[in-house]
């Protein structure tokens, strides 16, 4: 079995303020079992943007049905983008663990830049 890779095809995405940003991510394998999460930034200070397993993220919608069997697409769309949303977003795969899930692999990141709203 080939080891799972986390693919973020775009190094950067530019979006006008007020629009939605699509951040693409997919896995090359269904194994190992475990949730994915999206973060802005890396390291200890990273900000959780979306957790597949739990939580309420009103500005985030998933592009695909994540509950669908054999789904490999974990792209998200963030609505009503503001300059404060700029940064690098990482799609991270976790391996199911007990009691806590363990970070398994991260995508290379997608840098979101925000353009001024067209007048």
């Amino acid at each position: 079995e080939d080891e799972l890779q986390v693919i973020q095809p775009e190094k950067s995405v530019s979006v006008a303020a007020g629009e939605s940003a699509t951040l693409r991510c997919a896995m090359t394998s269904l194994i190992p079992v475990g949730p994915i999460m999206w973060f802005r930034g890396a390291g200890a200070g990273r900000e959780l943007i979306y957790n597949q397993k739990e939580g309420h993220f009103p500005r985030v919608t998933t592009v695909s049905e994540l509950t669908k069997r054999n789904n490999l697409d974990f792209s998200i769309s963030i609505s009503n983008i503001t300059p404060a949303d700029a940064g690098t977003y990482y799609c991270v795969k976790f391996r199911k663990g007990s009691p806590d899930d363990v970070e398994f692999k991260s995508g290379a990141g997608t840098e979101l830049s925000v353009r001024a709203k067209p007048s």
């Epitope: 693919i7 693409r24 997919a26 090359t28 592009v63 490999l72 697409d73 792209s75």
Partner: antibody, heavy 122, light 108 residues
Framework: QVQLVESGGGVVQPGRSLRLSCAAS????????MNWVRQAPGKGLEWVSA????????FYADSVKGRFTISRDNSKNTLYLQMNSLRAEDTAVYYC???????????????WGQGTTVTVSS | EIVMTQSPGTLSLSPGERATLSCRAS???????LAWYQQKPGQAPRLLIY???SRATGIPDRFSGSGSGTDFTLTISRLEPEDFAVYYC?????????FGGGTKVEIK
Amino acid sequence: QVQLVESGGGVVQPGRSLRLSCAASGFTFGSFGMNWVRQAPGKGLEWVSAITASGGSTFYADSVKGRFTISRDNSKNTLYLQMNSLRAEDTAVYYCAKDFTEVVGWLGMDVWGQGTTVTVSS
Amino acid sequence: EIVMTQSPGTLSLSPGERATLSCRASQSVSSSYLAWYQQKPGQAPRLLIYGASSRATGIPDRFSGSGSGTDFTLTISRLEPEDFAVYYCQLLGSSPRTFGGGTKVEIK
């Protein structure tokens, strides 16, 4: 540069067999899913078959299932399409095409060969 | 099996005009799995748009894609002479990876 070159096309009688090859260069062939797509004269594109990067899974259009077999040799950077029991309706230009990302069939096919022509005629 | 239907079959326009091409799926699909290609006579297809709305590398920004669910659109904001070609949408993700029948954009 990234390149795909098909070969093996030709004129063949109905019921006979033909094997197409696609030689890849300029990218890590063994990391990407690959596809065969065909185009009958004056018609649109028809997806024929796909294979995962490792070769472990294959996919076929109903029109060729049971007659065509896709395979790959990652050590030779080559994709194959074995076509058996050929019919007149298989007459087409056959293109090989690379998946855009390492995720099979996710976002499209970003590199295409120039095609090889298969004519099935008695 | 999901059927992809493109319309119109032919679009007759002049250089500088806006082209709007439609692709409709017979049932709802994820936008991540919708691609658009351009094909010129005697040439292989070229990937234009992936994920319904993202331009492939090197594709001019006059090409844009939009849509979700069952209805998807490729827009060419201002036709250049080299844009007159046949355009195909494709559903990916599942098997078969169906193409639409194509829309020919021809010079009026």
